[in-house]
Amino acid sequence: AVNGTSQFTCFYNSRANISCVWSQDGALQDTSCQVHAWPDRRRWNQTCELLPVSQASWACNLILGAPDSQKLTTVDIVTLRVLCREGVRWRVMAIQDFKPFENLRLMAPISLQVVHVETHRCNISWEISQASHYFERHLEFEARTLSPGHTWEEAPLLTLKQKQEWICLETLTPDTQYEFQVRVKPLQGEFTTWSPWSQPLAFRTKPAALGKDT
């Protein structure tokens, strides 16, 4: 077995992609490795080539089908193997049974847009991408707004504990440039984690009307 300095971590995007990262201290950067996926109840299997992302880690995406196709279900178990080339043969480095719906990480929300903006508030909407219909409404969101002179890390998190693909930001400052991001997470799954943050949406509040208290 590979020693404790190795890690093999994968997530399922709920539709047709399993993304994997394999890391091993002391492994050669030019080693040729791949991930094989063998579902227990499907006729297909899939392979991806691990490509270096840092000094000691490699990543790849198992593309299981068309982006919006439902390739796995809650009862599937996928056996994932890391194989590395040693001379003319492949050596198995790690074997993991993977329950896809216990290891979810969705795609970042897309199509962010300003629905309506005023001096002190802004209504923003977005869409989820490549998310399984199995979730129905069992999703939650986190959002954050970047104010002038602050960093994303300083931005307070707004939690939406339901499938709500819009938000009304309030108590904003007039005539001020902001940026907004949102991420999504299904409620199910032992190792389910937040999606990446969406691309930032830039918007500007309207200036206060002259001579009026808004």
Epitope: G4, S6, Q7, Q96, D97, K99, E102, N103, E190, F191
Partner: nanobody
Framework: EVQLVESGGGLVQAGGSLRLSCAAS????????MGWFRQAPGKEREFVAA????????MYAVSTEGRFTCSRDNAKNTVYLLMNRVKPEDTAVYYC????????????????????WGQGTQVTVSS
């Protein structure tokens, strides 16, 4: 804390199958990661498989070559090891183990990572 009792060992012919069970009592089973290890005569105890608290990830020793399947039933407080296409080199005492600390299921744990052990069950594979 839990107590562990293995069962299902015995004599089996090469190429055959065997299912080991490990029943837990006296604790909250779902709060433990569970593992299987084995020890052949004159050899060190070696890792076979380990599964996370909810069973979402299970790691297997490369030596199992995909012949073994580890699963757990938290409703029955039991973890299983299904051994298919067994070989004479699978002959060993098989131990079930529980781990109180968090296990991500992304790496191979050492036997020292597990705090609670069963008494073991003998598996003998004849050629």
């Amino acid at each position: 804390e839990v107590q562990l009792v293995e069962s299902g060992g015995g004599l089996v012919q090469a190429g055959g199958s065997l299912r080991l069970s490990c029943a837990a009592s006296g604790g909250t089973f779902s709060s433990y990661a569970m593992g299987w290890f084995r020890q052949a005569p004159g050899k060190e105890r070696e890792f076979v498989a380990a599964t996370t608290r909810g069973g979402g990830r299970t790691m297997y020793a490369v030596s199992t070559e995909g012949r073994f399947t580890c699963s757990r039933d938290n409703a029955k407080n039991t973890v299983y090891l299904l051994m298919n296409r067994v070989k004479p080199e699978d002959t060993a005492v098989y131990y079930c183990a529980a781990r109180t600390s968090y296990y991500s299921g992304t790496y191979y744990p050492a036997s020292s990572d597990f705090d609670i052990w069963g008494q073991g069950t003998q598996v003998t594979v004849s050629s």
